[in-house]
């Protein structure tokens, strides 16, 4: 069954945590649907964003942070492992120095920590996708 | 009650026709939700687009056409009559020489015809909105 989109869930992250998302683009890549995953510092959607991950399917991925309301330097990648019309599995792992983003089991993007992952309180998944799975796995202490 | 998004409906347009849309952005303007309305030449979403109207809420509006699979010259407007968090009513009227876009009863954008409006066979409304009304009024012959 489908999860609501935008999908919002409280989350606490630290080194070893992994966020897993399964979904499908709602339009063909010609029409440039988007997927966005935002790691927020508060439960409010207007809060700062520790890690912003936005896919324009078929074109590019941008990653950034929003600090005290201001977007910082954008990191862009043309790597496009997503397949037109196909379901994807996205996993974002918190490493000691960076986020590692896997697409369908393949390491596809990295983003160095700008803000501590421990500052994350909420994850939001939204834009032009249907969502079938969202999970945060916590490292056993 | 809410209409599904993306929302697709068969439509025939000509001078005097008006497409009316009521909806609400799914996110605060700080997060830059989008609204897109596309007038297609076929019932398929990959078909050409006679009139492409895309709002990046709080930032800008772009209008364009997609002809034989290629995007043409984009028209951009910074006019932003949409209100953060508020419902909007959008009406797109087919005039003899152009489309006239009204937002909450106020004339806000125009786009000169590049392709005959009679070429339109389908309208799609999508991206980051909830949709409560979609209507095409046909000119009585």
């Amino acid at each position: 069954s489908l999860l609501p989109v935008p999908y919002t869930e409280a989350a606490s992250l630290s080194t070893g945590s992994t966020v897993t998302i399964k979904g499908r683009p709602l339009a063909c890549f010609l029409n440039e649907p988007y997927l966005q995953v935002d790691f927020h510092t508060e439960m409010k959607e207007e809060s700062d964003i520790v890690f912003h991950f936005q896919v324009c399917f078929g074109r590019r991925v941008v990653m950034n942070s929003r600090e005290y309301g201001a977007w910082k330097q954008q990191v862009e990648s043309k790597n496009m492992p997503f397949q037109d019309g196909q379901e994807f599995e996205l996993s974002i792992s918190v490493l000691p120095d960076k986020y590692q983003v896997m697409v369908n089991g393949q390491s596809s993007y990295t983003f160095d920590h700008r803000i501590k992952p421990e500052a994350v309180k909420m994850v939001q998944v939204w834009r032009d996708i249907s969502l079938t799975k969202f999970n945060v796995s916590y490292l056993k202490r | 009650s809410l209409l599904p998004v993306p929302y697709t409906e068969a439509a025939s347009l000509s001078t005097g026709s008006t497409v009316t849309i009521k909806g609400r952005p799914l996110a605060c303007f700080l997060n830059e939700p989008y609204l897109q309305v596309d007038f297609h030449t076929e019932m398929k979403e990959e078909s050409d687009i006679v009139f492409h109207f895309q709002v990046c809420f709080g930032r800008r509006v772009v209008m364009n056409s997609r002809e034989y699979g290629a995007w043409k010259q984009q028209v951009e407007s910074k006019n932003m009559p949409f209100q953060d968090g508020q419902e909007f009513e959008l009406s797109i009227s087919v005039l003899p020489d152009k489309y006239q876009v009204m937002v909450n009863g106020q004339s806000s954008y125009t786009f000169d015809h590049r392709i005959k409006p009679e070429a339109v066979k389908m309208v799609q409304v999508w991206r980051d909105i909830s949709l409560t009304k979609f209507n095409v009024s046909y000119l009585k012959r």
């Epitope: 005290y68 910082k72 330097q73 120095d97 160095d112 700008r114 501590k116 | -």
Partner: antibody, heavy 122, light 107 residues
Framework: QVQRQESGPGLVKPSQTLSVTCTVS??????????WSWIRQPPGKGLEWIGY???????YYSPSLKSRTSISRDTSNNQFSLQLSSVTPEDTAVYYC??????????????WGKGTLVTVSS | SSALTQPSAVSVSLGQTARITCQGG??????VAWYTQKPGQAPVLVIY???ERPSGIPERFSGSSSGDTATLTISGAQAEDEAEYYC??????????FGGGTHLTVL
């Protein structure tokens, strides 16, 4: 092993522009994810961050010095440079270049040059 | 004036534990780094990402942070640890600030 060496005129007149260059050996300044910073230290005082340039060429400056600061790079010579305009005697300091992994706020600055003293005086 | 506040001086007996604090940062959000500097020399990174030690830095150096205070701890201070110590953090991820420095004396 990455080496850095600052070079610049030891004496600059007030109101002129101070220029210092850092030559990097043992690794390209365009190699990700490193960034390259300028820090200064007035005699007998603490450290002050001036700005940095990322491996992609993006620049970031201290708000207090931004209006007078420009950091650029010469990739062919593997150098990056600092220009500080409209100097006063308060700009007298040892100027250091340093390397950091990605953003210096996250990883700190792990390799420093020896520093070059620039005196502003007429 | 610095956005990060350090005590100007700290004394420790040889072999004892020294703690140098750094206050005023948003350490719940931004990492802190620590440097040591001896007269006439360039600073040397001793701690990054709050508590990580670069290779070659002795294990007696450790770091921690909580709220608006970060702490550099030197367990079993040695004579060669006598130096100036600076904390460094971010006002944002692209705006760096240093503390005013702490002179550590090993008695």
């Amino acid at each position: 092993q990455v080496q850095r060496q600052e070079s610049g005129p030891g004496l600059v007149k007030p109101s002129q522009t101070l220029s210092v260059t850092c030559t990097v050996s043992g690794g390209s300044i365009t190699t990700g994810p490193y960034s390259w910073s300028w820090i200064r230290q007035p005699p007998g005082k603490g450290l002050e961050w001036i700005g940095y340039i990322g491996y992609s060429g993006s620049t970031y400056y201290s708000p207090s010095l931004k209006s007078r600061t420009s950091i650029s790079r010469d990739t062919s010579n593997n150098q990056f440079s600092l220009q500080l305009s409209s100097v006063t005697p308060e700009d007298t300091a040892v100027y250091y270049c340093a390397r950091s992994r990605s953003s210096p706020t996250t990883f700190g600055m792990d390799y420093w040059g020896k520093g070059t003293l620039v005196t502003v005086s007429s | 004036s610095s956005a990060l506040t350090q005590p100007s001086a700290v004394s420790v007996s040889l072999g004892q534990t020294a703690r140098i604090t750094c206050q005023g940062g948003d350490f719940g959000r931004y990492y802190v780094a620590w440097y040591t500097q001896k007269p006439g020399q360039a600073p040397v990174l001793v701690i990054y990402q709050d508590s990580e030690r670069p290779s070659g830095i002795p294990e007696r150096f450790s770091g921690s942070s909580s709220g608006d205070t970060a702490t550099l701890t030197i367990s079993g201070a040695q004579a060669e640890d006598e130096a100036e110590y600076y904390c460094q953090s971010g006002i944002s991820s692209d705006n760096i600030v240093f503390g005013g420095g702490t002179h550590l004396t090993v008695l």
